[in-house]
């Protein structure tokens, strides 16, 4: 192979100019002609100076994997995927996400200690004694010792999930 400069690529025993980002080689250079470069078609891209005969396929962000498109594909840059709302990343690929999972739902008797982010799941915590959370979505557990005003006495101690009325 010939020793080509950084902005050239080898063709047989010769060096041809690379095409710019967003273009691929339609025809290699000749003695009197430069490289003929052709723009990448929609849905394809090349992100660097290159000697490629075909542009690369843009990645698809699969909603079934909990993904959404955070940056659309352009002819010079691949699409970037992020997590759909209510999801966090479980497989990181460089600076973007390859797969996401839905946030955990706190069970009854638990409170949301920390809401989920794009990189972290929801953190749940059991309600302390004497408090309850009936649906697991509350950030604070509620005190469960107060009886309804038409009841004179407490019927039972209650649990962290439900209170007796």
């Amino acid at each position: 192979l010939p020793s080509c400069k950084e902005d050239e690529y080898p063709v047989g025993s010769e060096c041809c100019p690379k095409c710019g980002p967003g273009f691929h080689v339609r025809q290699a250079c000749g003695e009197q002609t430069g490289t003929v470069c052709e723009p990448c078609s929609p849905g394809t891209y090349i992100a660097h100076f290159n000697g490629l005969s075909k542009c690369l396929q843009c990645q698809m962000c699969d909603p079934a994997m909990g993904l959404r498109t955070s940056r659309n594909c352009s002819t010079t840059a691949n699409a970037l995927c992020g997590c759909s709302p209510g999801h966090f990343c479980i497989i990181q690929d460089g600076d973007h996400c390859a797969a996401c999972r839905a946030y955990a739902t706190s069970s009854p008797g638990q409170r949301v200690q920390k809401g989920g982010t794009e990189s972290q799941d929801t953190l749940c915590q059991n309600c302390p004694p004497g408090t309850f959370s009936s649906n697991g979505t509350l950030e604070e557990c509620q005190h469960g010792t107060k009886c309804s005003k038409w009841l004179v006495t407490e019927a039972g101690p209650g649990t962290s999930s439900f209170r007796w009325v």
Epitope: K5, E6, D7, C16, P17, K18, G20, P21, C29, T33, G34, T35, C37, A47, H48, F49, R71, T76, A77, N78, L80, D95, H96
Partner: antibody, heavy 113, light 106 residues
Framework: QVQLKESGPGLVAPSQSLSITCTVS????????VNWVRQPPGKGLEWLGM???????DYNSALKSRLSISKDNSKSQVFLKMNSLQTDDTARYYC???????WGQGTLVTVSA | QIVLTQSPAIMSASPGEKVTMTCSAS?????MYWYQQKPGSSPRLLIY???NLASGVPVRFSGSGSGTSYSLTISRMEAEDAATYYC?????????FGSGTKLEIK
Amino acid sequence: QVQLKESGPGLVAPSQSLSITCTVSGFSLTGYGVNWVRQPPGKGLEWLGMIWGDGNTDYNSALKSRLSISKDNSKSQVFLKMNSLQTDDTARYYCARSYGSYWGQGTLVTVSA
Amino acid sequence: QIVLTQSPAIMSASPGEKVTMTCSASSSVSYMYWYQQKPGSSPRLLIYDTSNLASGVPVRFSGSGSGTSYSLTISRMEAEDAATYYCQQWSSYPFTFGSGTKLEIK
């Protein structure tokens, strides 16, 4: 041997136009893109624009309205024209092949009355 | 446009010391390019396509990174490496340079 050499006026009065020529040798302008980059004294590099082998141009959006890049393949020359110069356009102006494999030595342009 | 922030702005290193400087992009870029410039000289291409060494560049230089975070490393500092280093992205128009890192010898 690949070479690029810029030639410019040196001194330009405020509000006037600037024309710089980049003369290249050792490669054909039909194949390679040429960039224009400038550097104010003591400051960093600023990309101005580029003309590709096929004649297409791309510009720095902040300067696009004032810039024009063209070339003459047969004379191996690339031209930079910039309008309405102000004192903060004082800089060394460089031409470079594609992504900077080769650079000219630059030409210093001073904008002053 | 994509803003490239280089850090530190100025640093110094002793001969033989390992040096790392970073280039942070305001949004994701596909590749990074690094240039070296000495006072009174034109810039010189050091690294292309993030990690490829340009011809004639000593192997003590290396580049790495992806997305928004890139770095240039000199494995063992030499006196001749004292210069200003610039990163540049070619992923998105306009092609922008970083503000530069000035590397001094101790």
